[in-house]
């Protein structure tokens, strides 16, 4: 399939101009190769009319140009002074005309409307509102006012001042007579349909002295905006339908065969199953505008999308709409998703998130996709040291291993953690990948005590039991904080007795805290890794209390409390519910994200600038 994309149909009127944009994958070769616009002949050839190498056919001399925009991967053909002879089938393409790297475009140039003298032309978008103004003289001020539509040779009454409304206009038309000072009446038609287009006649009075005014109403079907995105990337549809529909249900639908438009998502809670986990409908602004983000684009997502407003939450005649034609380029560098990562209750997962490796300095984020409320993705953690309050002690985002991949570790898993998560950055918004966490049957591999209490000034030893399967892995203990997990010294105490059917290769590795202070209170993780690739982790909360009796504390598995189902947080922590991935434009002004965070979360830690080497192999 050709990766070149453009408008399938272009319609215009004699004398007007058109601008045709064609998209191509912006590879180095494509950016510099020849671009052309040619007309298809009856026998299958394609005659060049204009090219990027300076050629212009005599038919286009002085009225056309072709401009390449290599940085965007587009070129634009402008054609002026159109005539009906320009109607036909064309191709825009790259390279040689016959090579197949092209897109078929149909251009239809129609005759301009033959209008009567003194005709006012109203050009309005489908679904919108038109106000037809009808002047009259003083002598007709008290007489019947009416609007007719010319159907063939006959005028058909649409509305009049005695209260008549043509059934085709019921519920969407009114006739307003201005105050006595103004000799004008107006007819307002809402929710315009394509069938409303045509010639109208306003009339005040019914005799030979009546005042008449001709109006030509043109109802425009919205030209679809062309959207060219990479397979597995993201697309954002910004839908601005105007304040008059601010309180009406909104929808995004995809046109299937004929006039059908299948709802993708709407504000009434409907969502197509094919978009589960990969779509967000962002809350609308006061003016009624909203946006829809779809990530993990698939081949079958290509097509025509309409957004609109209607109380049913789906396309109906007269819905104001916006249109897009989405092309999905299969020559993509973005990895496939969703990745499915499996974890067990009580255990952990280490999720590897891809990002555009050109953007290593970008801020990394991880959010939980929620299907409720039309899809939203509240942030859970970022690479600047912010962690959502409910995830304190069990979630960390690490820049490692780097070079196009970052790591998110989540432990103390419960069935509530199952679901879709998004990996994203404040850089390339096309790189939003989904990962699905599944909670499967099984036991955590690492065994640690539940909550542990240390005594001020004493020594605390906390065990972590590693089964044989991790014999070839690095084992570590670290202290969790908002910016990562700082590595701590630990002791290998030899084989563990915590596993059945496990030989000398099992290990008991202990964390020792000497002369415990208040600063030692917090979450500690033991885990396994391979260089900068992180594996399983287990978390222990160490509380610190005043001395009761002398001696050091050695915590065993049996003596430990059961891990609490919920972590109880300080009153100093507040949930940041407003920190959600909504409008991706937010990332254009990073300050907006930072401000929300700083105001909402008093616990923000400063960012640790040291590399993992400087921190003695810590996880930051």
């Amino acid at each position: 399939k050709s990766p070149i994309f453009g408008p399938e149909e272009v319609n215009s009127v004699e004398g007007n101009s058109v601008s045709i944009t064609c998209y191509y994958p912006p590879t180095s070769v494509n950016r510099h190769t020849r671009k052309y616009w040619c007309r298809q002949g009856a026998r299958g050839g394609c005659i060049t009319l204009i090219s990027s190498e300076g050629y212009v056919s005599s038919k286009y001399a002085g009225r056309a140009n072709l401009t390449n925009f290599p940085e965007n991967g587009t070129f634009v053909v402008n054609i002026a002074q159109l005539s009906q002879d320009d109607s036909g089938r064309y191709k825009c393409g790259l390279g040689i005309n016959s090579r197949g790297l092209s897109f078929d475009v149909s251009l239809e140039v129609s005759q301009g409307p033959g209008l009567l003298n003194d005709t006012k032309v109203y050009t309005v978008d489908l679904g919108r509102t038109v106000t037809i103004n009808c002047p009259f003289k003083t002598e007709n001020a008290q007489k019947r006012k009416s609007l007719y539509k010319q159907i063939g040779l006959y005028p058909v009454l649409v509305i009049d001042s005695s209260g008549y409304v043509n059934p085709n206009y019921t519920g969407r038309i009114r006739l307003d007579i201005q105050g006595t000072g103004q000799l004008l009446f107006s007819v307002v038609i809402n929710q315009l349909r394509l069938s409303d287009a045509g010639q109208y006649l306003c009339q005040a009075g019914d005799d030979s002295n009546s005042n008449k005014k001709n109006a030509d109403l043109q109802v425009l079907k919205p030209e679809p905006e062309l959207v060219y995105e990479d397979l597995r990337g993201s697309v954002t549809f910004h839908c601005a339908l105007g304040p008059e529909v601010a309180n009406v249900a909104k929808f995004l639908c995809r046109q299937s065969s004929g006039e059908n438009c299948d709802v993708v998502v709407n504000t009434l809670g409907k969502r197509a199953p094919a978009f589960e986990g990969r779509i967000l409908l962002n809350p609308q602004d006061k003016d009624g505008s909203f946006s829809v983000v779809i990530t993990g684009l698939r081949k079958e997502d290509a097509g025509r999308y309409l957004c609109g407003a209607h109380s049913d939450g789906q396309l109906q005649e007269g819905s104001p709409i916006q249109a897009w034609q989405l092309f999905v380029n299969e020559e993509s560098t973005i990895p496939r998703s969703p990745t499915v990562v499996k974890g067990v209750a009580g255990g952990s997962v280490a999720v590897l998130c891809p990002y555009n490796r050109k953007e290593s300095k970008s801020i990394k984020y991880w959010c939980l996709w929620e299907g409720a409320q039309n899809g939203r993705c509240p942030l859970l953690v970022d690479s600047e040291g912010w962690v959502k309050a409910q995830y304190e002690g069990r979630l960390s985002l690490l820049e490692e291993p780097g070079n196009g991949t970052f790591t998110v570790i989540l432990n103390q898993l419960t069935s509530r953690d199952a679901g879709f998560y998004w990996c994203l950055t404040n850089g390339d918004t096309l790189w939003r990948t989904t990962v699905e966490i599944k909670i499967i049957e099984g036991e955590p591999n690492l065994k640690v005590p539940g909550n542990v209490t240390a005594v001020l000034g004493e020594t605390l030893k906390v065990p972590c039991h590693f089964p044989c399967k991790f014999s070839s892995y690095e084992k570590y203990w670290c202290k969790w904080n908002n910016t990562g997990c700082q590595a701590l010294p630990s002791q290998d105490e030899g084989p563990s007795k915590a596993f059945v059917n496990c030989d000398e290769n099992s290990r008991l590795v202990s964390l020792t805290l000497n002369l415990v202070t208040r600063a030692d209170e917090g979450w500690y993780w033991c885990g396994v890794k391979q260089g900068h690739f992180y594996g399983e982790t287990a978390a222990v909360y160490v509380a610190v209390e005043e001395r009761k009796a002398a001696g050091s504390r050695d915590v065993s598995l049996a003596k430990a409390d059961a891990a609490p189902d919920e972590k109880v947080l300080d009153s100093g922590f507040r949930e940041i519910e407003n920190k959600a991935i909504q409008d991706p434009r937010l990332f254009a002004e990073e300050k907006a994200v930072a401000d929300t965070r700083d105001q909402a979360d008093g616990s923000r830690a400063s960012v640790d600038s040291g590399s993992s080497e400087e921190q003695g192999g810590s996880s930051r």
Epitope: P335, R336, S337, P338, T339, V340, V341, K342, G343, V344, V349, A350, L352, P354, R357, P401, G402, N403, G404, T405, T433, I440, G442, K529, Q530, H532, F533, Y534, G535, E536
Partner: nanobody, 116 residues
Framework: QVQLVESGGGLVQAGGSLRLSCAAS????????MGWFRQAPGKEREFAAV????????HYADSVKGRFTISRDNAKNTVYLQMNSLKPEDTAVYYC?????????WGQGTQVTVSS
């Protein structure tokens, strides 16, 4: 779901080379980190090498560092392990794994035997 099939194993003399391949079926191969593990008779399965989705980062067990190279071709849904300077102690069944640091998806394994 990812299915993995290893190939390329066999009998080789010490100092020789082999190239293992792991072909993946399933739409999402290119988003997974991939790893190679090995299991010698009577021993635990041990880690050998891992590579990120884009090949941007790799890591090797000390025992194979400098001799083995992991690579991948996402267009072919395949991950490779180039094994040079083979030693008798490299004799094992070699397994390919998707998402090797969590609960991996495993292949069936391919036998590598290094004779002295």
């Amino acid at each position: 779901q990812v299915q993995l099939v290893e190939s390329g194993g066999g009998l080789v003399q010490a100092g020789g080379s082999l190239r293992l391949s792991c072909a993946a079926s399933g739409r999402t191969f290119s988003s997974y980190a991939m790893g190679w593990f090995r299991q010698a008779p009577g021993k635990e399965r041990e880690f050998a090498a891992v590579i990120t989705w884009n090949g941007g980062s790799t890591h090797y067990a000390d025992s194979v560092k400098g001799r083995f190279t992991i690579s991948r071709d996402n267009a072919k849904n395949t991950v490779y392990l180039q094994m040079n300077s083979l030693k008798p102690e490299d004799t094992a069944v070699y397994y390919c794994a998707a998402d090797p640091m969590n609960s991996p998806y495993w292949g069936q394994g391919t036998q590598v035997t290094v004779s002295s």
